[in-house]
């Protein structure tokens, strides 16, 4: 039985050219996290973090994705094209798979200054 829940940063906005932390947290379960996948809105993999292998950043994102903090992901040098949904998929044993969703809106610099309340501290 899957007892866990995924908490995410929800809907966030960030400044074009800036960076943002995508963060998911799995709670209320003792299941072992074997792998976390980070996917973009078009289902392309940005990165994985495997307990036995470490982090792997996929080639298309190597220059502007950094692992962490924790099991999260830092997306850098944001462009307007980065706007959209992001998914964290937690593969766990014995529970199975948990999935979280984050919506990122990338804003022009002038607009972003008025949207700070949505950003991660």
């Amino acid at each position: 039985m899957m007892t866990g829940t995924i908490e995410t940063t929800g809907n966030i906005s960030a400044k074009k050219g800036g960076s943002v932390i995508l963060q998911c947290h799995l709670s209320s379960t003792m299941a072992q996290v074997t792998q976390v996948n980070w996917e973009q809105h078009d289902h392309s993999l940005l990165a994985i973090r495997n307990a036995e292998l470490g982090w792997h950043i996929y080639p298309a994102f190597k220059d502007r994705v950094a692992p962490g903090p924790g099991l999260g992901l830092t997306l850098q040098s944001l462009t307007m094209n980065d706007t959209g949904e992001y998914f964290c998929t937690y593969h766990t044993y014995p529970d199975g798979t948990y999935r979280g969703r984050i919506f990122l809106e990338v804003l022009e610099s002038s607009v972003a200054e008025h949207s700070a309340r949505f950003q991660i501290p």
């Epitope: 495997n50 307990a51 036995e52 470490g54 982090w55 792997h56 950043i57």
Partner: antibody, heavy 119, light 107 residues
Amino acid sequence: EVQLVESGGGVVQPGRSLRLSCAASGFTFGSYYMHWVRQAPGKGLEWVAVIWPDGSNKLYADSVKGRFTISRDNSKNTLYLQMNSLRAEDTALYYCAKPVPKSRALDVWGQGTMVTVSS
Amino acid sequence: DIQLTQSPSSVSASVGDRVTITCRASQGISSWLAWYQQKPGKAPKLLIYGASSLQSGVPSRFSGSGSGTDFTLTISSLQPEDFATYYCQQAFYLPWTFGGGTKVEIK
């Protein structure tokens, strides 16, 4: 005794193919991620590829991506490396290796099989 | 990819000497570093994993330390069988990468 034995190496011309095998014994092969690591003559170690325990995922070094394919047959306790479009720079001793669980380090290595790419 | 720089590339030492080898990573890798020993014609042998954990069966004269970007392998009292090449390996990121090696030679 935990053991890995590689085979399939040899001399091959550039552009040709070769398939390496690694026979595992003494441990529950199907529970482990398995790796290939190579070593060019007189040089250091280079990680080549890894495959998930159930074969569902594979990752490769950039130097071999698109040319090499790692696979496994858990019913035969055997790991494979299919090497296509071979180049002179692929000349090396190829090792298969098993990790220590949760350590991200390789504690059991085969004796290696030599691949020489030469015209 | 993460680059690992080992120093020195070679060291001449005598039996009983204390030998220190360093490994520097181009980015922080937490404690995901292993050390291997390799003798000519043989496969590498795991000595240390997790930067400081001694692999089962490895003599206690071998020790590892460090975290982040700077790591050290120490042989407290060099024995005749320790003359070999030593490699560090990072496993924070895939692809895993190895240092260039340090050859420990007899003085």
